[in-house]
């Protein structure tokens, strides 16, 4: 990028540069018109018959350097060929010399600084590449010379440029004074300010563009070269903040549009809001969950929003004495999550009707909560109690929801307790055809024993037709019509209002071989 300090092509007033000495044959200002009929100014000199050692100086106005360390001067000039000048003597030249003088203010006068090299600093002696030929009465022909010179290093507030003619016939058509600077550059979301190079290469610190954040690591920098070009160097530096994506060739961060989001800083573009979420503003780093939907604390910010599951379905109970097996189907709606678990709540009601949460005597296998399979076994149920089990399905966002948790209930009433097994049977008397039996009255928890059932069969005769039953209301019984000297297996069970208890252990008894042995008491 070039920053102009002076361009005579753009000057609208007389330049009125200073000449020295005040003699004939000096530089003179002329004007012309460009294609748009705007005035353009030039300087001409043509003292080809000058006295030896006589120089014609032309000095520009004071030019503030505006921080430039090196300034470039592009000269456009034409130079008349000495051979085309009939009056040209040996002092005719086809070169001129360029100088500059630095000062902190516009202090030069018509006589100072002294018109000579030192204090003036010589830049170069300029020779014409193209010479203009002029024949009498004809128009001059020849190409314009363009020469760019480099001034510096400069340190004062400004400078003057001076041209010294020592016998040329030439026209200085235009002067462009400029310095080179690295233009403001935005690359990889990092902005590097416009920089005037003060050395061969200058490191320039970058700053993140609006809505970008620095990447970890060293802060981004780029090198501005003396020629006004940025040194090519990969720049990692900044990335768009959450809620913003890179745009316009990685030169700016654009806010995510409504309905999109970007959760992290860094590369990547805004994504549509995940399921069951929305963003009503631009620049969203996260999409808000719809009413009734949530993200668990452990869910990524970009995860869909989910909802608690519906209740489990079709709870099936199988009661087996004091044990209960419950089984159910998964809820219709999982809420959009994989982390489904089940939990049970339990209430028990006594026969009298008073109800309370289940006591600690119940055990749940594998447990009352955090169940991953849809079943549980409950043990330790008490007889003649009514149990209500509420089966709930839960997931990672159930704890975030307000309102009741849906459940599927199941009611189970346990049987009243039947009498225990009768096991201590003894034979009180035996004969060849009968056996008299007695047993202890079992302790029935739910009311008295109403009667007993005796089940017996001859040992070795196992078929259903060989089994015989006898009911008795006392805790004794006589089995008649038995075979002589045969072995019998006897079992007894008691009945209360709750029903029959289990048969006790088989008792082994034997009938007499003959009458002579008489009645004999036998103990089991």
């Amino acid at each position: 990028l070039e920053e102009t300090l002076l361009n005579t092509k753009l000057e609208t007033a007389d330049l009125k540069w200073v000449t020295f000495p005040q003699v004939d044959g000096q530089w003179e200002e002329l004007s012309g018109l460009d294609e748009e009929q705007h005035s353009v100014r030039t300087y001409e000199v043509c003292d080809v018959q000058r006295a030896p050692g006589q120089a014609h100086w032309l000095r520009t106005g004071w030019v503030p350097r505006r921080g430039a360390v090196h300034v470039y001067a592009t000269l456009r000039f034409t130079m008349l060929e000495c051979l085309s000048l009939p009056r040209a003597g040996r002092s005719c030249k086809e070169t001129f010399t360029v100088f500059y003088y630095e000062s902190d203010a516009d202090t030069a006068t018509a006589l100072t600084p002294a018109w000579m090299e030192n204090p003036y600093i010589k830049v170069d002696t300029v020779a014409a590449e193209h010479l203009t030929r002029k024949r009498p009465g004809a128009e001059a022909t020849g190409k314009v010379n363009v020469k760019t010179l480099r001034l510096g290093p400069l340190s004062k507030a400004g400078f003057y440029l001076a041209f010294q003619d020592q016998g040329a016939c030439m026209a200085l058509l235009s002067l462009h004074l400029f310095y080179k600077k690295c233009a403001q550059l935005t690359v990889n979301l990092t902005r590097f300010p416009e920089t005037v190079p003060r050395e061969l290469v200058v490191p320039v610190a970058g700053s993140c563009v609006v809505d970008a954040v620095p990447a970890p690591g060293p802060s981004p920098s780029l090198y501005c070269r003396e020629d006004g070009q940025w040194a090519e160097q990969p720049v990692t530096g900044c990335s768009c903040a959450p809620g913003f994506e890179a745009a316009e060739g990685n030169t700016k961060c654009r806010a995510c549009a409504q309905g999109t989001f970007k959760p992290l800083s860094g590369e990547g573009s805004c994504q549509p809001c995940p399921a069951n979420s929305h963003s009503n503003t631009i620049g969203s780093a996260v999409c808000q969950c719809r009413v009734g939907y949530f993200r668990a604390r452990t869910d990524p910010r970009g995860a869909p929003c989910t909802t608690p599951p519906s209740a489990p379905r079709s709870v099936v109970s199988r009661l087996n004495g004091s044990s209960l097996h419950l089984e159910w189907s998964a809820p219709l709606e999982s809420g959009g999550r994989e982390d489904l678990t089940y939990a049970l709540r339990c209430r028990e009601c006594r026969p009298g009707g008073s109800c309370a949460p289940c006591g600690g005597d119940l055990t749940f296998d594998p447990g009352p909560r955090d169940l991953v399979e849809p079943w549980v076994v409950v043990r330790g149920l008490r007889p003649d109690f009514t149990y209500t089990f509420e089966v709930t399905a839960l997931n990672g966002v159930s704890s975030l929801a307000t309102g009741p948790v849906p459940f599927e209930p199941v009611n189970v009433t346990t049987d009243r307790e039947v009498p225990p097994a009768v096991s201590d049977i003894r034979v009180t008397r035996s004969s060849p055809s009968s056996l008299s039996l007695a047993w202890a009255v079992p302790r029935a928890p739910s009311g008295a024993v109403l009667d007993y059932e005796v089940k017996y069969h001859e040992k070795g005769a196992e078929g259903p037709s060989s089994v015989r039953f006898l009911k008795t209301s006392e805790n004794r019984a006589e089995l008649r019509g038995l075979k002589r000297g045969a072995s019998y297996l006897v079992q007894v069970r008691a009945r209360s209002e709750a029903g029959y208890g289990p048969f006790g252990q088989e008792h082994h008894s034997q009938t007499q071989l003959d009458e002579s042995e008489g009645w004999r008491e036998q103990l089991a």
């Epitope: 609208t12 007033a13 007389d14 009125k16 005040q22 003179e28 200002e29 002329l30 004007s31 012309g32 018109l33 009929q37 705007h38 005035s39 030039t42 001409e44 043509c46 034409t78 008349l80 203009t132 002029k134 009465g137 128009e139 001059a140 016939c169 026209a171």
Partner: antibody, heavy 126, light 108 residues
Framework: QVQLVESGGGLVQPGGSLRLSCAAS????????MSWVRQAPGKGLEWVSA????????SYADSVKGRFTISRDNSKNTLYLQMNSLRAEDTAVYYC???????????????????WGQGTLVTVSS | DIELTQPPSVSVAPGQTARISCSGD??????VHWYQQKPGQAPVLVIY???KRPSGIPERFSGSNSGNTATLTISGTQAEDEADYYC???????????FGGGTKLTVL
């Protein structure tokens, strides 16, 4: 010798036309930027019109714009001023004048008039 | 556009210095030229580029220009210097020339 000689002046009625000529000699006319300057009786100098060396650029004072036309014939070393719709206030001595010339580049000229003709009187009256 | 203002007349005794002023806004930033016109004659350039003298013009004629005023100075004025003097400068485009109203120099 180097000189400019105007001709074509005279008496003309208001609304009438007149064409002034300026014959150049003694210098390379086709390298010179030329102008017309007038001077009303007892008054000061007033610039009227200008033309560049090749004749492609022209310029006029507001007082004559649209009525006067400057032109040149470099092959005849002559400058012209065609004056139409003349008014009484156009009565003046009309001078042709040469701008200071470049040494060799007719695209440019100095801003002063370094050569003047003797003038020609134009009288606009009924 | 610039307007150039001159005093209508200036009088000077022979041999004395005559100064004729020409004023205009920021005139010092423009080149000013001076013309001498004697009765019945065409104007003659006496000073150009503020202070330069064309060949054939006596050394007693000099010029300066700064600020808002340009000055034509005739030192050791002679009777033959009696004439009208006009300053001129160009306006915003180089082809438009403006003249001052003229100053009549009388040599007493």
């Amino acid at each position: 010798q180097v000189q400019l000689v105007e001709s074509g002046g005279g008496l003309v009625q208001p609304g009438g036309s007149l064409r002034l000529s300026c014959a150049a000699s003694g210098f390379t006319f086709n390298n010179a930027w030329m102008s017309w300057v007038r001077q009303a009786p007892g008054k000061g100098l007033e610039w009227v019109s200008a033309i560049n060396a090749k004749g492609q650029f022209t310029s006029y004072a507001d007082s004559v714009k649209g009525r006067f036309t400057i032109s040149r014939d470099n092959s005849k070393n002559t400058l012209y001023l065609q004056m139409n719709s003349l008014r009484a206030e156009d009565t003046a001595v009309y001078y042709c004048a040469r701008k200071g010339m470049s040494f060799y580049n007719n695209k440019y000229a100095k801003s002063m008039f370094d050569l003047w003709g003797q003038g020609t009187l134009v009288t606009v009256s009924s | 556009d610039i307007e150039l203002t001159q005093p209508p007349s200036v009088s000077v005794a022979p041999g004395q210095t005559a100064r004729i002023s020409c004023s205009g806004d920021n005139l010092g930033k423009k080149y000013v030229h001076w013309y001498q016109q004697k009765p019945g004659q065409a104007p003659v350039l006496v000073i150009y580029y503020d202070s330069k003298r064309p060949s054939g013009i006596p050394e007693r004629f000099s010029g300066s220009n700064s600020g808002n005023t340009a000055t034509l100075t005739i030192s050791g004025t002679q009777a033959e210097d009696e004439a009208d003097y006009y300053c001129s400068a160009w306006t915003t485009t180089m082809m438009h020339i403006v003249f001052g109203g003229g100053t009549k120099l009388t040599v007493l």
